[in-house]
Amino acid sequence: GITIPRNPGCPNSEDKNFPRTVMVNLNIHNRNTNTNPKRSSDYYNRSTSPWNLHRNEDPERYPSVIWEAKCRHLGCINADGNVDYHMNSVPIQQEILVLRREPPHCPNSFRLEKILVSVGCTCVTPIVHHVA
Amino acid sequence: GITIPRNPGCPNSEDKNFPRTVMVNLNIHNRNTNTNPKRSSDYYNRSTSPWNLHRNEDPERYPSVIWEAKCRHLGCINADGNVDYHMNSVPIQQEILVLRREPPHCPNSFRLEKILVSVGCTCVTPIVHHVA
């Protein structure tokens, strides 16, 4: 990896698990410079592989609310608005980092956790399994 | 929101900015219980709205490497393998949390940051703007 010169103004850590345990400021900085007003908002409905969004809530997690996509059909919507089963709708998944309260119910102590979320769906050509 | 009873075994925080600054264990727990062997691995190529993945690296961020999807075409791939410009390939974006070293170059002090990433692409019916 890239070696970073240490800033002399860094806070000191007395934690015996250092550098495993770090200090994190929860005052979120939003770097979304994207000013495009048309984001993924209505793609779920206009897609040829449409999906629904389901609210996943967990008070022991930060962020506590995550939206999960579920593809509406196994096939894809064709030009006539019907489902075409010669094509497959599949979820696009991403591994994201969240904070899990640890020990449980603690307001100021967390552990990083990796979870797999489904963000939306895409239409793919099926894999054809040839029988020998 | 849901009120969580505080665990008496929680670590104490002397930080003057508490509860804005919290302790986070970076020993990642992987909660991906999904045993589905077929994940999004080859969807980028098989999709009717195919995409390429670009590596975005930033040593001041955790995770330092994030993969960004960029749609290959403005249109979508039709049954003949040609690009159909009557349909649009669009990126599916998601806001994710990352940790930003703050102050810069500090190994044990971070600030939560929200960034918008493109995870993949989907094929949508275009919005038709009727001229009055």
């Epitope: 629904n52 389901h54 609210r55 999960e68 579920k70 593809c71 509406r72 489904s118 | 219980t33 077929k38």
Partner: antibody
């Protein structure tokens, strides 16, 4: 516990609109989708349509021009409207909850909880 | 529409004995992306609404006794009851949830001999 209860008139005149309500309790509306299914006397089950958690709908093409499914989340109620009915629409009408599976990334069209059903007779 | 054909349509059974119902689909119910078969079994007891027994061909719904088991793939599926009990009487339906509209078999009536 999970409960679904259908209600509405038991008798509808031909060419009129059949209107039924399904009141639900014991589960989260934002998570689950609800289907309507019917069963003509002495016959099998026929899926009419679904309303997804976000309010979108999908209908059996056999009913498409006549059917509307809607939701009133404030009342925990779903409704089915079937227009231009004939004697062939006489049936027991069920509302049913579509199964929700957490780590599964498709909508589910298996029904894991059903109402008790309501008989609607179409006759003049 | 996908046609689901069950056999037999009537099945007289003896308590304690096994029973088997067949369901055939006019098209394959196997989804290539996840290798799941989109087939379910329901039981409608006399005077009641249907209840889900099995989904994805062989996954038992919670609370369903383990004497019920499902098998098959593609277009041919089977529901087996290892030892029939008196409470198992009713009409059994298979249902496909791959293709819209989601269709049911015509039903198999299981009754005690």
């Amino acid at each position: 516990q999970v409960q679904l209860q259908e209600s509405g008139p038991g008798l509808v005149k031909p060419s009129e609109t059949l209107s039924l309500t399904c009141t639900v309790s014991g589960f989260s509306l934002p998570s689950h989708s609800v289907s309507w299914i019917r069963q003509p006397p002495g016959k099998g089950l026929e899926w009419i349509g679904i309303i997804w958690n976000q309010g979108g709908t999908d209908y059996n093409s056999a009913f498409k021009s006549r059917v509307t499914i809607s939701v009133d989340t404030s009342k925990n109620q779903f409704s089915l409207k079937l227009s231009s009915v004939t004697a062939a629409d006489t049936a027991v009408y069920y509302c049913a909850r579509n199964m929700y599976i957490t780590d599964y990334y498709y909508e589910n069209y298996f029904m894991d909880a059903w109402g008790q059903g309501t008989l609607v007779t179409v006759s003049s | 529409d996908i046609v689901m054909t069950q056999s037999p349509l009537s099945l007289p059974v003896t308590p304690g004995e096994p029973a088997s119902i067949s369901c055939k689909s006019s098209q394959s119910l196997l989804f290539s992306e996840n290798q799941k078969n989109y087939l379910a079994w329901y039981l409608q007891k006399p005077g009641q609404s249907p209840q889900l027994l099995i989904y994805w061909t062989s996954t038992r719904q919670s609370g369903v006794p383990d004497r019920f088991s499902g098998s098959g793939s593609g277009t041919d599926f089977t529901l087996k009851i290892s030892r029939v009990e008196a409470e198992d009487v009713g009409v059994y339906y298979c249902q496909q949830s791959y293709y819209t509209p989601y269709t049911f078999g015509q039903g198999t009536k299981v009754e005690i001999k």
